[in-house]
């Protein structure tokens, strides 16, 4: 910008140096040069001389008018053409900005990642404002009525140490900039209901050499939460459609899940968990890729029709990736495909 130049006159903006995008704007230049009666006053925007909509108001002052100014930022300066001077003489300059008042923050969500010591709140900010916009996060105890405020730019982490006096809170976010202020809807939060278990990790997988080969996936978490509900999704790397298996997990020991999969295929697995009965999920774990061994017999195993898929307190369903480039963003395409029962003679899955 050019906010620190020495002016030989003045430059001002109507309605102001920061204004709503799309407004009509007038920029005035008034010279106060010694030993100069300017022949002309010129305006420059971002270093380029302007040719149109310039009005000479009087001997010392000129105005440029912009219809529907829509650039987020511009730097303006004006100069004088003084008789006997080869170069134009600088009068003054200003940084100008246009933007929007903020949208009301939406989809406010607060979670506590286990062991983090923080409550993390996020929200959608809406359309870009193009100007400095801050978010004031209000956290009000429903038990003590005490209210705390936090300043944020896109999300906030609030130490759980500062949330000791209460379990129930009302949280809302104000979006503020110089053009306006909007409030989010209020979110009722119970600290015990928003804990997301410590990350679940797939540690390894192996395929047995049985007559009907099976793949065992080993996965774990450091969570201290006793009742945890998990989903594992899996697909071949060439496929768009995921199968999802559901589990009630107990992480006092490593989980083992058995799958009957296509032989000689590369599969990707991911797992995520939530506290049973709660609504906040972990993000999907990092993709774990496993190559199944080559087929010894001729049988082609279909993972969703095989009687050998273990189905103890599990559900298998199919989901399809919206984009092969975004494996984390999936859309449920079907209801549960089937809820199976353990095939006779097969051990049940742990959890």
């Amino acid at each position: 910008g050019i906010t620190s130049i020495n002016c030989s006159g003045d430059m001002w903006v109507e309605p102001g140096e920061i204004f709503q995008m799309g407004m009509n704007v007038s920029i005035y230049c008034q010279e106060a040069l010694k030993h100069c009666r300017p022949r002309n006053l010129y305006f420059y925007k971002n270093g380029f001389k302007e040719e149109f909509d310039i009005t000479r108001i009087n001997r010392t002052t000129a105005r440029i008018w912009y219809k529907g100014f829509s650039e987020p930022h511009a730097y303006m300066h004006c100069t004088a053409e003084c008789p006997g001077h080869f170069q134009e003489t600088l009068i003054c300059g200003k940084d100008i900005s246009s933007g929007h008042p903020p949208d009301a923050p939406s989809n406010l969500t607060c979670v506590i990642y286990e062991y983090s010591g923080n409550m993390t709140c996020t929200w959608n900010t809406g359309k870009p404002t193009y100007i400095d916009t801050k978010y004031i996060v209000h956290v009000k105890s429903l038990e003590t009525e005490e209210e705390q405020q936090y300043l944020a730019s896109s999300y906030v982490k609030i130490s759980t140490d500062s949330l000791q006096g209460s379990r129930k809170y009302l949280v809302w976010v104000q979006a503020v900039n110089s053009l306006g202020m909007e409030n989010s809807q209020q979110l009722h939060v119970h600290l015990d209901d928003i804990v997301i278990p410590s990350a679940s990790i797939i540690s390894r997988a192996e395929t047995t050499n049985d007559t009907v080969p099976k793949t065992i996936v080993y996965w774990k978490s450091k969570t201290m939460i006793e009742k945890v509900f998990c989903e594992m999704r899996y697909k071949t790397t060439t496929n768009q459609t995921w199968s999802v298996k559901e589990f009630d997990a107990n992480f006092t020991y490593v989980q083992q899940s058995e799958f009957y999969l296509e032989p000689d295929s590369k599969y990707v697995f991911q797992v995520r968990c939530q506290e049973t009965g709660k609504r906040n999920w972990q993000p999907w774990s990092s993709p774990f890729v496993h190559q199944t061994s080559q087929e010894t017999g001729k049988r082609n195993w279909q993972p969703w029709s095989s009687p050998f898929v273990h189905q103890t307190s599990q559900t298998v369903s199919q989901v399809t990736a919206k984009s092969s480039h975004e494996p984390q963003k999936m859309e449920m395409l079907s209801a549960t495909i089937f809820r199976g029962h353990p095939a006779s003679g097969n051990h049940q899955d742990i959890g």
Partner: nanobody, 116 residues
Framework: QVQLQESGGGSVQAGGSLRLSCTAS????????MGWYRQAPGKERELVSM???????FYADSVKGRFTFSQENAKNTVYLQMNSLKPEDTAMYYC??????????WGQGTQVTVSS
């Protein structure tokens, strides 16, 4: 620890003016986003005015055109010039220092009472 001290409150007739001051001590004044807030009896604390890093200022609709936020960086002080005061401006006025991600720090407040 950040300390903020407000002054300049008082009682005034409707239509009158007051100038509130807030001086900050023992911290890096420049790291704060400074704001003026007010709390009327039985109501939530509300933001009145806040200055932004780009030099722009927010004013609540109820005070636009009547209140002016200014600051004197050399003195670590911010001001709220309040003109054309109305009875509904009666409240405890607080200045606040907010840094990103941290809990907003308040001063003790200064009472403004506007009678009709």
């Amino acid at each position: 620890q950040v300390q903020l001290q407000e002054s300049g409150g008082g009682s005034v007739q409707a239509g009158g003016s007051l100038r509130l001051s807030c001086t900050a001590s023992r911290y890096t004044y420049s790291s704060c986003t400074m704001g003026w807030y007010r709390q009327a009896p039985g109501k939530e604390r509300e933001l009145v005015s806040m200055v932004f890093s780009d030099g722009s200022t927010f004013y609540a609709d109820s005070v636009k055109g009547r209140f002016t936020f200014s600051q004197e960086n050399a003195k670590n002080t911010v001001y709220l010039q309040m003109n054309s005061l109305k009875p509904e401006d009666t409240a405890m006025y607080y200045c606040g220092c907010a840094t990103l991600g941290s809990r907003t720090i308040w001063g003790q407040g200064t009472q403004v009472t506007v009678s009709s």
